[in-house]
Amino acid sequence: QPTCDVSKVTSLLEVNCEDKKLKKLPTDLPADTGILHLSKNQLGTFSTSYLVHFTHLTHLYLSRCELTSLQAHEKLLKLETLDLSHNHLQSLPSLGRALPALTTLDVSFNKLGSLSPGALEGLGQLEELYLQNNDLKSLPPGLLMPTTKLLKLSLANNKLRELPPGLLDGLEDLDTLYLQGNWLSTIPKGFFGSLLLPFVFLHANTWYCDCEILYFRNWLQENPNRVYLWKEGVDVKAMTANVASVRCANLGNAPVYSYPGKGCPTNEGDIDYDDYADTPTTRTEVKFSTNTKAHTTYWGLFYSESSTSPDSQMTSLPPIHEPTKKQPTFAHTEIPGFTTLPDTMESNTAFYSLNNTVPTTTPEPTSTQATPEPSSTPMLTTPVPTPEPSSIPMLTVPVSTPEPSSTPMLTTPVSTPEPSSIPMPTIPVPTPEPSSIPMPTIPVPTPEPSSTPMPTIPVPTPEPSSTPMFTTPVPTPEPSSTPMLTTPTLTTPESSSTPSILVSTIPPVLTTTLAPPESIPKTVLEQFYTLEPTLPRTLESTIIIPEQNSLNSQAVPQASSDTPKSNPFLNSDFCCLLPLGFY
């Protein structure tokens, strides 16, 4: 009896050796194998030289093979698909010389910390590149220059703080770009050029709204129907555009597209981001109406019929789990591990509406129910009661001051404390007069009929940090109609540097060890995102993001960085958007 199962698909001999506890390649592999499944084995290392005699090989699946090293010295001239996902690769060898016909490369869910400038040299046929869920902190300039045929690029859920200018230059066919779940603070001027990118994912980053963000803001305003919010298990083409998912980390999660840019110099480069100032007709061609039909029409214009038509077997989502035995040639639809904003997590506290006003009507309390991955810990489902619109109550929370000797929660030099010993600094919160029901820490003022004012956020100046993440000063807001949030000033004991919040990709569970006192009403604001025990240096908290045109909001997981020195900036505007347990 042969080690592996043999079948045929679209004229290719398919050999399935999945999950056979193999430590090396089987000796009885058919010489005419076209599709080879080796996933879920314990190969440890792999070399293209092992397969040099398999001249028909077009698809090779090596996910979950515990690979720590990969060598690509021998040519596999027909190989089109290489799946290396869910392994332990810390570096990616240059594949172009050995695999010149490669069209799909999946190296997601590995441990890549960086890529060499020539990593993709010679991969001129590459159409899909999946690098999500790695440890990429930066990308070399010119990385994608050789891959001019690229259609799909996923860099989601890495640790990218910036993108090299010109990264997308020449990628005229790119139709889907995943950048969510990184530490990006801005987008370089001219980054998108004149690309007609139908699907872009940009949420769950630490976008910093100051004058440097204007190019990006303008691009968002011009392309609202190209920006999507990732939803687990949903085909990209079935998702709804959500430009409001891209939010200013330093301005109370206001949508980037609505950032007013007051006081910023009007710069030609910011406004005319793709050099179309003199050609308004071209501009209107790429504009979207907000209705579905216009979007569908647009999609039809820019999607390659051959690879991504509705009838096609190729889906437009990055592959994750292994292909079925019968149809291995095609990509797959789920991306576990992508940072998602769960649909079911809602809060009925409006703190930033998309028109930059706060609604005067009080929404009905909604019962919130989160559905994380199976966990023995119950989720918070208690609705947040809403007070009368006229009152602005705040939480009455007596939170004990930590012992002076212990590490405060929000200081940068975070050691790895046991969950039980994490202290919580005091939050001075006034007691509401009109209502006995405590509200979350976000006040909801009643706007006056003539204008849409919102109180400004006091911005405390932190002590000078040895590694300041953002050098742009936050200007003190002048009295204007610019909406801001009122938040109590956070008192952090012995805080000597900037606190940090980073994006995490961990499913939500309730962390009982950090729960505030029993007297505090349990709301969705107190939900925590717990990291796996293998990542001990993380703080756990949540920020709230309202859905587009709705008072509901969704939670984005946040966490601290691996090292104290590499923390992104946490503006004080965050202070009251975090769950009490954070403090």
């Epitope: 698909v9 679209t10 004229s11 001999l13 058919p30 010489a31 096609s312 019968k326």
Partner: antibody, heavy 118, light 113 residues
């Protein structure tokens, strides 16, 4: 011209074995994938097994572990070893050639009848 | 396995008139890489072995009269005979050659009225 001639059919008891042969002529046998397809009396067509030009066999679940396809390129012959035969294996067995790497059947033999009955 | 369903199962025809047979697959037979649909048609005349008529949905095998044509994509396919002749009687089968196990339709018996 291409010719495929099957032989080896007959009456066999359930649980018994039988070996079918197919003699090929009129083409370069070693360059083509070959298959066996059967047709139960008064019924439709059912694929039984295939072997690639390189000699890799594959089967549907219904015969996997019971039937073995093989080829002898030197003799221009295709074989089907059938073990643990069942009543539902009763059919006319056709030898067929596939074109290139594709899996449609461009030439068929006249068939040989296999009857499994006690 | 991919299930192939033909209709009608029986088709009485008049010589000189057109005839049409439908074949549906339980999943798409379109290979997005080459935009080919992996479907073949065979005719088994009474007392004979099957003979290939069409492959890849619409490519006629050499020697097959041009009155036979195939069309369709994805999961819905059709074999058309523009003007039926007496020699066209027999059972017509569709077969998917997209992924193993190769499966056939149950057959459509074409007979002269």
């Amino acid at each position: 011209q291409v010719q495929l001639v099957e032989s080896g059919g007959g009456l066999v008891k359930p649980g018994g074995s039988l070996r079918l042969s197919c003699a090929a002529s009129g083409f370069t046998f070693s360059s083509f994938a070959m298959s066996w397809i059967r047709q139960a009396p008064g019924k439709g067509l059912e694929w039984v097994s295939s072997i690639t030009s390189a000699g890799t066999p594959y089967y549907p679940d219904s015969v996997l572990g019971r039937f073995t396809i093989s080829r002898d390129n030197a003799k221009n012959s295709l074989y089907l070893q059938m073990n643990s035969l069942r009543a539902e294996d009763t059919a006319v067995y056709y030898c067929a050639r596939s074109r290139g790497y594709e899996d449609y059947f461009d030439y068929w033999g006249q068939g040989t009848l296999v009857t499994v009955s006690s | 396995d991919i299930v192939m369903t033909q209709s009608p199962l029986s088709l009485p025809v008049t010589p000189g008139e057109p005839a049409s047979i439908s074949c549906k697959s339980s999943q798409s037979l379109l290979n997005s890489r080459n935009q080919k649909n992996y479907l073949a048609w065979y005719l088994q005349k009474p007392g004979q072995s099957p003979q290939l008529l069409i492959y890849f949905t619409s490519t006629r095998e050499s020697g097959v009269p041009d009155r036979f044509s195939g069309s369709g994509s994805g999961t819905d396919f059709t074999l058309k005979i523009s003007r039926v002749e007496a020699e066209d009687v027999g059972v017509y089968y569709c077969q998917q050659h997209y992924s193993s196990p190769w499966t056939f339709g149950q057959g459509t018996k074409v007979e002269i009225k």
